[in-house]
């Protein structure tokens, strides 16, 4: 968890405000979920470790036509604005497991809340 600020060029982890805003957006998504999120679309599971923001973006970007997560995609892009190199990209995904977007969002939310509680944003 030492380079959450950007996989392409390891830097500081996201500031508390950016992390808090992302958490709030994910909370909104989970609370406002009436029908299956993104029609039950499946995405690749990711390693919730270094490079997590880039990995989450790469996974969620494959969901098309789902306005509910577009703001999340753009906010994740804030942490990972430039594409990671091909070599780095290969290590971002757990390419053997697909889960529903709703579960992906819940898992990501739990992990980000944990980081926030532990003060891992300085």
């Amino acid at each position: 968890l030492t380079c959450l600020g950007g996989f392409a060029s390891p830097g500081p982890v996201p500031p508390s405000t950016a992390l808090r805003e992302l958490i709030e957006e994910l909370v909104n998504i989970t609370q406002n979920q009436k029908a299956p999120l993104c029609n039950g679309s499946m995405v690749w599971s990711i390693n919730l470790t270094a490079g997590m923001y880039c990995a989450a973006l790469e996974s969620l970007i494959n969901v098309s036509g789902c306005s509910a997560i577009e703001k999340t995609q753009r906010m994740l892009s804030g942490f990972c604005p430039h594409k990671v190199s091909a070599g780095q990209f290969s290590s971002l995904h757990v390419r053997d497991t697909k889960i529903e977007v709703a579960q992906f969002v819940k898992d990501l939310l739990l992990h980000l809340k944990k980081l926030f509680r532990e003060g891992q944003f300085n």
Partner: antibody
Framework: EVKLVESGGDLVKPGGSLKLSCAAS????????MSWVRQSPDKRLEWVAS???????YYPDSVKGRFTISRDNARNILYLQMTSLRSEDTAMYYC????????????WGQGTLVTVSA | DTVLTQSPASLAVSLGQRATISCKAS??????????MHWYQQKPGQSPKLLIY???NLESGIPARFSGSGSRTDFTLTINPVEADDVATYYC?????????FGGGTKLEIK
């Protein structure tokens, strides 16, 4: 409404320095990456610098080591410190919100003019 | 660097007709099933405005007269039908490879 207002452009001599500012409003500034893009007198656009919400910075080789992008999330201001300026740095400098490589630059300021001339 | 070549440099189209602008990249700008190519409109005296992201996605608030297509190295921006308000210079931009680069622009005029 998203608003980006650049300032600090001026006439400067080759080898000189200048610091540009961009005041942002209408969105949660700290949550988004930001960039500077310039447009030369011949109207060509060139990406100059980007900074992530986690303060990771990115530059093209043409400005690396001379320009520094930074941000003040408490004041919602983006900066571009330019040193060792050359005549080819003469351009309109735009501040833009960067929604990442998948979404491009959805919001741009009106620009501030930098002229490098003896 | 990925060089983007736009053609034509300028074109004149009658109101209500179709305008087609091409952007060719020196190498593929595709990544994980997406084409990292975006299109901008710049009216005289104004800053650029995002029209299309990822080759074919219409940015919020942009009229459906604008559309984008293409993949790998060949991309097209289409305006159909052209309106008087579309007089501007159009730029393509790639974000697949650092440094991010722009095309030289295509100036659209009304015939």
């Amino acid at each position: 409404e998203v608003k980006l207002v650049e300032s600090g452009g001026d006439l400067v001599k080759p080898g000189g320095s200048l610091k540009l500012s961009c005041a942002a409003s209408g969105f949660t500034f700290s949550s988004y990456a930001m960039s500077w893009v310039r447009q030369s007198p011949d109207k060509r656009l060139e990406w100059v610098a980007s900074i992530s919400s986690g303060d990771t910075t990115y530059y093209p080789d043409s400005v690396k080591g001379r320009f520094t992008i930074s941000r003040d999330n408490a004041r919602n201001i983006l900066y571009l410190q330019m040193t060792s300026l050359r005549s080819e740095d003469t351009a309109m400098y735009y501040c833009a919100r960067l929604d990442g490589y998948y979404f491009g630059f959805p919001y741009w300021g009106q620009g501030t003019l930098v002229t490098v001339s003896a | 660097d990925t060089v983007l070549t736009q053609s034509p440099a300028s074109l004149a189209v009658s109101l209500g007709q179709r305008a087609t602008i091409s952007c060719k990249a020196s190498e593929s700008v595709d990544h994980s099933g997406s084409s990292l190519m975006h299109w901008y409109q710049q009216k005289p005296g104004q800053s650029p405005k995002l029209l299309i992201y990822r080759a074919s996605n219409l940015e919020s608030g942009i009229p459906a007269r604008f559309s984008g297509s293409g993949s790998r190295t060949d991309f097209t921006l289409t305006i159909n039908p052209v309106e008087a308000d579309d007089v501007a210079t159009y730029y393509c931009q790639q974000s697949n490879e650092d440094p991010w680069t722009f095309g030289g622009g295509t100036k659209l005029e009304i015939k």
